[in-house]
């Protein structure tokens, strides 16, 4: 796994341990939490994440209306169970044995039930709604200009492939970025948009998982983006399965 | 040379704690996690967590989170384990043991725990 | 937690005679599996890392092979000090986990 070989340090996670007992000698960076070995010159999967910080010593509108099958993390933070690559296992279970059925960025899509709750696969979040409110300014930012620095920056910062970002949306003071990716899409080296929605996302709260590196400094043009509100919807490829109609509303 | 000192022997009564220590020499003692081994009398190897001394995190396996801590003294490059409530079924030998490929190992600690 | 399972519990082989120690994991843990042999009343000591790499200071005669989940050690011409136990051990993720070990005995 690369690392930053001269100080054995991992650029793109902070959450880690890094020593240089990998193979051949070279530098290895272990997830806290986990203890998996994680790979520097990428994202860190969000599982990995979210169970290192569980063990941490914590006019027209053009605004995209959510589908009624959109989901909000209501549920906020638990230590979730990952996979050998990392990912989401389909069932998460608390320390009292109450389960539920997760997408693959962890968000709750069942009603809990008990351990013999049957969780068959990973339903795939493909489309993802990150919604923005910005502080207000003296003038609403150029759209297009607007549109190209969120592209840079997604590409740039978190090497998500352009084509996963599908659009940017702007009615003042409001910001909404659509990512999309089918399973079908997403080659083996690719960043999946769950990783990189959640990098953003903590970038916005000023809790960057870079190491070393300070909040989002995002600029249109020379003035600054300030963010007030996020608020993240996710739609997976099946609807999900709760037995009464829920509010998603965040 | 790398070299990890544990002392020979420890002798205890049922009920009560012990500390084991592990002094490390010949390599930086920050840069590599230390990890703890138990071995009882004929059977196979235990792992029962490490400490990174660089940031004094620590894991435990299930098993052994209300028996063991773990700490460290960089001052002196010494990895120490405290054991609590100490029964005849932690009668065994404990080894520290260096980085994530435990390739240097101490001697081991015979802990033996008798009335 | 990751399982390990060793095969066979004991080995009985004659001087000069190959041998392979087997090690099965619960789940795939890539090449991050790590060989150990103890001697009676010593320290274990590594023989092989990651799977393959050698170390420096072990005798030629070991090697290792393997990935995923299934891997072996080898040793091409057994010799009296051979003589011990062998464990293999995985370093994927916490908590790591041993073998339950192989014990080699010379007819």
């Known amino acids: 796994h690369t690392a930053a070989q001269d100080n054995c340090t991992c650029p793109t996670n902070k959450m880690t341990v890094c020593s240089p007992d990998g193979p051949g000698g070279r530098c290895q960076c272990r997830a806290l939490g986990s203890g998996m070995a994680v790979d520097c010159s990428t994202l860190t999967s969000k599982c990995l994440l979210l169970k290192a910080r569980m063990s941490a010593p914590k006019n027209a509108r053009t605004l995209v209306r959510p589908s009624e099958h959109a989901l909000v993390d209501n549920d906020g933070l638990y230590d979730p169970d990952c996979d050998p690559e990392g990912r989401f296992k389909a069932r998460q279970c608390n320390q009292t044995s109450v389960c539920w059925c997760v997408n693959s960025v962890g968000v709750r899509r069942t009603d809990k039930g008990d351990l013999s709750l049957r969780c068959d696969e990973v339903v795939r979040t493909h489309h993802i709604l990150i919604e923005l409110r910005h502080r207000p300014t003296d003038r609403a930012f150029n759209h297009s200009d607007l549109d190209s620095e969120l592209r840079r920056l997604f590409q740039e910062r978190y090497k998500l492939h352009p084509s996963f970002l599908s659009a940017v949306h702007y009615e003042e003071p409001t910001i909404q970025i659509e990512l999309r990716q089918n399973a079908s899409q997403k080659g083996l080296r690719d960043v999946d948009i769950a990783d990189a929605a959640y990098y953003f996302e903590r970038d916005i709260k000023g809790e960057s998982l870079f190491m070393g590196r300070r909040g989002l400094d995002v600029q249109v043009r020379g003035e600054p983006l300030h963010v007030e509100r996020t608020l993240i919807y996710y739609l997976d490829e099946k609807p999900p399965q709760f037995s009464m109609k829920r509010l998603t509303a965040g | 040379q790398v070299q990890l000192q544990q002392p020979g022997s420890e002798l205890v009564r049922p009920g009560a704690s012990v500390k084991l220590s592990c002094k490390a020499s010949?390599?930086?003692?920050?840069?590599?996690?230390m990890h703890w081994v138990k071995q009882r009398h004929g059977q196979g190897l235990e792992w029962i967590g490490n400490?990174?001394?660089?940031?004094?995190?620590?894991n435990y396996d299930e098993k052994f989170k209300s028996k063991g801590t773990l700490t460290v003294d960089t001052s002196s490059s010494t990895a120490y384990m405290h054991l609590s409530s100490l029964t005849s079924e932690d009668s065994a030998v404990y080894y520290c043991?260096?980085?994530?490929?435990?390739?240097?190992w101490g001697q081991g600690t015979t802990l033996t725990v008798s009335s | 937690d990751i399982l390990l399972t060793q095969s066979p519990a004991i080995l009985s082989v004659s001087p000069g005679e190959r041998v392979s120690f087997s090690c099965r994991a619960s789940?795939?843990?890539?090449?991050?599996i790590h060989w150990f042999q103890q001697r009676t009343n010593g320290s274990p000591r590594l023989l092989i890392k990651?799977?393959?790499e050698s170390i420096s200071g072990i005798p030629s005669r070991f090697s290792g092979s393997g990935s995923g989940t299934d891997f072996t050690l080898s040793i091409n011409s057994v010799e009296s000090e051979d003589i011990a136990d062998y464990y293999c051990?995985?370093?994927?993720?916490?908590?790591?986990?041993f073998g339950s070990g192989t014990k080699l005995e010379i007819k």
């Open positions: 400490i990174y001394p660089g940031g004094g995190y620590t």
């Open positions: 051990q995985q370093s994927n993720s916490w908590p790591f986990t």
């Open positions: 990651y799977a393959s």
């Open positions: 789940q795939n843990i890539g090449t991050s």
């Open positions: 043991t260096r980085s994530s490929v435990f390739d240097y």
């Open positions: 010949g390599y930086t003692f920050t840069s590599y996690w």
